[in-house]
Amino acid sequence: GIAIPRNSGCPNSEDKNFPRTVMVNLNIHNRNTSTNPKRSSDYYNRSTSPWNLHRNEDPERYPSVIWEAKCRHLGCVKADGNVDYHMNSVPIQQEILVLRREPRHCPNSFRLEKILVSVGCTCVTPIVHHVA
């Protein structure tokens, strides 16, 4: 593996007293970057498996707003605009880490949580089911 340089002042994570809780600065470093994926590219419209973006809002989570993709079609769009059902549009899912308020409604206390989000759609060959 790659050796990561370690600051001699870092706490020993193998110590049984190593904290399970940490202080996190929620001021986003690159806040100027667009958080609405619609603005960053138009792949969602140009793709052979186009998708729509939906705002998923949860005040008990940080970040509270996540944009999720839903495929527009069961099939894939051909160059002529026709839908080809011999191919399938499927969501591309990504596991991400978010902070969940715990206990609920507490402004400054969070627990790390993994969630699965759909970030776009792609075109795949369908699973063929053979009829006996």
Partner: antibody
Framework: QVQLVESGGGVVQPGRSLRLSCAAS????????MHWVRQAPGKCLEWVTL????????LYGDSVKGRFTISRDNSKNSLYLQMNSLRAEDTAVYYC?????????????WGQGTLVTVSS | SYELTQPPSVSVSPGQTASITCSGD??????VSWYQQKPGQSPVLVIY???RRPSGIPERFSGSNSGNTATLTISGTQAMDEADYYC???????????FGCGTKLTVL
């Protein structure tokens, strides 16, 4: 006006064939994916099959695969369902339905339905 | 294969809010549409793409979809809303459209 009208239903013996038709009017038929949906008496809706705008791409529900064939004639604004090897469980009202231009997960126009009874 | 589960029946008093649920594994990742079917009539689309209402459908009909459940909400329910309601989505694994088995809405 914008409508779909099914025809061709009736009483047929098990193992025999029947062809249903659906006449479309009032909209650009050739621009829409079309579907057949059926409903057995007193039962749920069941999707049967679909055909793409140009007729090149088709999908079938497991219960009818290999027995039913969907087709269309855009020059006649017509949709068809050829049903072979009919079984008692195929008894139902058959609806033709138009797929929404915004995606398949919506049928925005339905016909009045035609009843198919499979009985000896 | 993918399944959509609906309660067989829901009862509501006139003027009250009716909520009809539709459950399926990770349903929020799929689009859901809702259909109203009155006795002896063809189904009518009332909600598509989870929340959108076709023209001609009253504003009292609304939809939502999160987690494993999509919900059709009818606010200020009227006697004319008494009908069977079906949810629908698609399943990529079987490349087919899937209907729930319907919920009978009774306006008391």
């Amino acid at each position: 006006q914008v409508q779909l009208v099914e025809s061709g239903g009736g009483v047929v013996q098990p193992g025999r064939s029947l062809r249903l038709s659906c006449a479309a009017s009032g909209f650009a038929f050739g621009s829409y994916t079309m579907h057949w949906v059926r409903q057995a008496p007193g039962k749920c809706l069941e999707w049967v099959t679909l055909i793409s705008f140009d007729g090149r791409s088709k999908l079938y529900g497991d219960s009818v695969k290999g027995r039913f064939t969907i087709s269309r004639d855009n020059s006649k604004n017509s949709l068809y369902l050829q049903m072979n090897s009919l079984r008692a469980e195929d008894t139902a009202v058959y609806y033709c339905a138009r797929g929404s231009v915004r995606g398949e997960a919506a049928f925005d126009l339905w016909g009045q339905g035609t009843l198919v009874t499979v009985s000896s | 294969s993918y399944e959509l589960t609906q309660p067989p029946s829901v009862s509501v008093s006139p003027g009250q809010t009716a909520s009809i649920t539709c459950s399926g594994d990770n349903l929020r990742t799929k689009y859901v549409s809702w259909y109203q079917q009155k006795p002896g009539q063809s189904p009518v689309l009332v909600i598509y793409q989870d929340t959108r209402r076709p023209s001609g459908i009253p504003e009292r009909f609304s939809g939502s979809n999160s987690g494993n459940t999509a919900t059709l909400t009818i606010s200020g329910t009227q006697a004319m809303d008494e009908a069977d309601y079906y949810c629908m989505t698609w399943d990529v694994d079987t490349t087919s459209m899937i209907f729930g088995c319907g919920t009978k809405l009774t306006v008391l």
